[in-house]
C-alpha cells in the first residue's frame, strides 16, 4: 500500500521495496523492506518510519525494524527513504505493511490476562474466561523470554475461583540486562476454538517478593527488638520492609519503614546470612506486643505497582494484661 | 548522629570543570542511596540523581543525565557531583541528601552554593 | 514522567489556624513513596511525612499526611509560628512546586 503525503514534494526518493512483516517468538514483529529501485547515485540512503499513529519515529540506515508488541490488534508501519537524517526533509512515498491478529471471535479471547513474578523465582500468570467460551475449555499457556532458545508450554494450569492460571519457572539470570527485558505470554485453547491473547511482562514491573520470616523478638529496657529472614534473590538496595507492632493494651497500631538492617545489637544473633533487625523503641514490655512484617520492591529497581508481599506470619512476645 | 557535611561554595567560569563532595558520617553509608537535589535562586527542587555506595549503581534524572556525574567513595564516606563543562544556567544551591529505599531523603547535608559566571 | 502539582501556591494564615496542604499526582501513585518537606529561608529541606503518613523522627504530631492514589494531604492542625515555610511534595525523582504558607 502506498501513502502519499498532503504536501506537494520536492525531489524526493523512490519508495522502498518489498516491504514484508513477521512475527518471531511470539510477540516480535519484524519488518524488512529493499532499498528503493533507482535511488540517485548520490544518495546516502536512510529510512525513515512510523507506526500507524504516527508513534515512535525513527531514522535509521537499516533495511529491518522490529517491536515487540502483544499481537491484540492490528498494527502497521510505514517505510520511507530519504538521503539523510534530517526529520525535516521529505521521505519517499510512504509505503505502508500491517499485521493482523490472529483470527477468532473477540468475545471468546481470554480478558484480564496478566502475570506476576514471584521472588524473582517463577511467574504466575491469571486470567478470566473470555465471554463466549465453553466452561469446559482446556487452555493452554506459551511463554518465551530472551534466555529461552524456544517458546515454552507452561505446563502447571489450575483454577482459582473464576480465574484460571498457570506458572513457570523464571529465575533471575546474573545477567545484569535480564531484568531490562520482557517475557512474551500467549493464552489460547488446545482445541483452537479460542482466539489467542498476548501479554508483554516487563521483567521490571509486577515483582512480588516472598514475605520475610520473623525469627526472633526480644525486649531491653523499653525497646523491642525484631530479627527477620529477608526474602532471597533480592540485593538490599532493591527492598524495604513495614514492621507493624500490635500493643494489646493501649490498642496502638505502630508501623516503621525500615532499610535492611545490619543485626549489630548484642541483643540479636549477630552475622547471621540474609537477616536484618530492626529495634522498636518505647514499647511496654508488660502487655503484648504483636509483630508482622511485610516487604516491598524499591522503584528505583522495580516499577511500581503497589505489590507488597503477603504479610509475614505473626510472632508475639510480652504478657496479655488479665481485664479487671 | 546522622550528618552529612558539604563542600565549600564555589565561584566558576563557564566551561570550567567543578566536583562537589557529600561526606557521610553516623550511620553505614554503603546501606543508603545518597540523592543530589538542585536550588536554582528563588526555585522549587530539583531530583538530579542518585548512587548506591554499596555498588556505585547510579539513577539520573532524564533532565540531567548526561549533564552531571554522580559518583561515590566508600572508603572515605564520600558522594560526589560533577561537571566537566559548567554552564551559566548551572548557578544554584546543590543539595545531598541521604535517601532509603522508598525513596524519601530523611536527611539533607548544608548544600553547596555553585556560581556560574563569566 | 508522573508531574505533582501542589496547591495552594500560598496560602495566607494566622497562628493558631488550621493548614490544609494538596499535592496531586498525575497518575497513580503507590502512598508508600510519596514524601512531604518543609524549608524555611536559607536552609536545606526538612522531611516531615515519609510513606503519605508516617511522621519522620522528631516531627510534632501537628504535622499530619493522608492520601492515596492521586490525592495526598499535608494537614498542620494549629499553625505554630515556626511553620511558616515553603512546603514541597516528593515521589522518588519528582517533587511538586511548593506551596508557600505564610503569615495573614
Known amino acids: 500500500d502506498y501513502k502519499d503525503d498532503d504536501e506537494s514534494r520536492t525531489e524526493t526518493q523512490p519508495p522502498v521495496t518489498n516491504l514484508s512483516v513477521s512475527v518471531e517468538n511470539l510477540c516480535t514483529v519484524i519488518w524488512t523492506w529493499n532499498p528503493p529501485e533507482g535511488a540517485s547515485s548520490n544518495c546516502s540512503l536512510w529510512y525513515f518510519s512510523h507506526f500507524g499513529d504516527k508513534q515512535d519515529k525513527k531514522i535509521a540506515p537499516e533495511t529491518r525494524r522490529s517491536i515487540e508488541v502483544p499481537l491484540n490488534e492490528r498494527i502497521c508501519l510505514q517505510v520511507g527513504s530519504q538521503c539523510s537524517t534530517n526529520e525535516s526533509e521529505k521521505p519517499s512515498i510512504l509505503v505502508e505493511k500491517c499485521i493482523s491478529p490472529p483470527e477468532g471471535d473477540p468475545e471468546s479471547a481470554v480478558t484480564e490476562l496478566q502475570c506476576i513474578w514471584h521472588n524473582l523465582s517463577y511467574m504466575k500468570c491469571s486470567w478470566l474466561p473470555g465471554r463466549n467460551t465453553s466452561p469446559d475449555t482446556n487452555y493452554t499457556l506459551y511463554y518465551w523470554h530472551r534466555s529461552l532458545e524456544k517458546i515454552h508450554q507452561c505446563e502447571n494450569i489450575f483454577r482459582e475461583g473464576q480465574y484460571f492460571g498457570c506458572s513457570f519457572d523464571l529465575t533471575k539470570v546474573k545477567d545484569s540486562s535480564f531484568e531490562q527485558h520482557s517475557v512474551q505470554i500467549m493464552v489460547k485453547d488446545n482445541a483452537g476454538k479460542i482466539k489467542p491473547s498476548f501479554n508483554i511482562v516487563p521483567l521490571t514491573s509486577r515483582v512480588k517478593p516472598d514475605p520475610p520470616h520473623i525469627k526472633n523478638l526480644s525486649f531491653h529496657n523499653d525497646d523491642l527488638y525484631v530479627q527477620w529472614e529477608n526474602p532471597q534473590n533480592f540485593i538490599s538496595r532493591c527492598l524495604f520492609y513495614e514492621v507493624e507492632v500490635n500493643n494489646s493494651q493501649t490498642e496502638t497500631h505502630n508501623v516503621f519503614y525500615v532499610q535492611e538492617a545490619k543485626c549489630e545489637n548484642p541483643e540479636f544473633e549477630r552475622n547471621v546470612e540474609n537477616t536484618s533487625c530492626f529495634m522498636v523503641p518505647g514499647v511496654l514490655p508488660d502487655t503484648l506486643n504483636t509483630v508482622r512484617i511485610r516487604v516491598k520492591t524499591n522503584k528505583l529497581c522495580y516499577e511500581d505497582d503497589k505489590l507488597w508481599s503477603n504479610w509475614s506470619q505473626e510472632m508475639s512476645i510480652g504478657k496479655k494484661r488479665n481485664s479487671t | 548522629e546522622v550528618q552529612l557535611v558539604q563542600s565549600g561554595a564555589e565561584v566558576k567560569k563557564p566551561g570550567e570543570s567543578l566536583k562537589i563532595s557529600c561526606k557521610g558520617s553516623?550511620?553505614?553509608?554503603?546501606?543508603?542511596?545518597i540523592g543530589w537535589v538542585r536550588q536554582m535562586p528563588g526555585k522549587g527542587l530539583e531530583w538530579m540523581g542518585v548512587i548506591y555506595p554499596g555498588d556505585s549503581y547510579t539513577r539520573y534524572s532524564p533532565s540531567f543525565q548526561g549533564q552531571v556525574t554522580i559518583s561515590a567513595d566508600k572508603s572515605i564516606s564520600t558522594a560526589y557531583l560533577q561537571w566537566s563543562s559548567l554552564k551559566a544556567s548551572d548557578t544554584a544551591m546543590y543539595y545531598c541528601?541521604?535517601?532509603?529505599?522508598?525513596?524519601?531523603?530523611?536527611?539533607w547535608g548544608q548544600g553547596t552554593l555553585v556560581t556560574v559566571s563569566s | 514522567e508522573i508531574v505533582l502539582t501542589q496547591s495552594p501556591g500560598t496560602l495566607s494564615l494566622s497562628p493558631g489556624e488550621r493548614a490544609t496542604l494538596s499535592c496531586r499526582a498525575s497518575?497513580?501513585?503507590?502512598?508508600?513513596?510519596l514524601a512531604w518537606y518543609q524549608q524555611k529561608p536559607g536552609q536545606a529541606p526538612r522531611l516531615l511525612i515519609y510513606?503519605?503518613?508516617s511522621r519522620a523522627t522528631g516531627i510534632p504530631d501537628r504535622f499530619s499526611g493522608s492520601g492515596s492514589g492521586t490525592d495526598f494531604t499535608l494537614t498542620i492542625s494549629r499553625l505554630e509560628p515556626e511553620d511558616f515555610a515553603v512546603y514541597y511534595c516528593?515521589?522518588?525523582?519528582?517533587f511538586g512546586q511548593g506551596t508557600k504558607v505564610e503569615i495573614k
Open positions: 510513606g503519605a503518613s
Open positions: 553516623g550511620y553505614s553509608f554503603t546501606s543508603y542511596w
Open positions: 541528601a541521604r535517601m532509603p529505599n522508598w525513596g524519601s531523603f530523611d536527611h
Open positions: 497518575q497513580s501513585i503507590s502512598s508508600s513513596y
Open positions: 516528593q515521589q522518588y525523582e519528582t
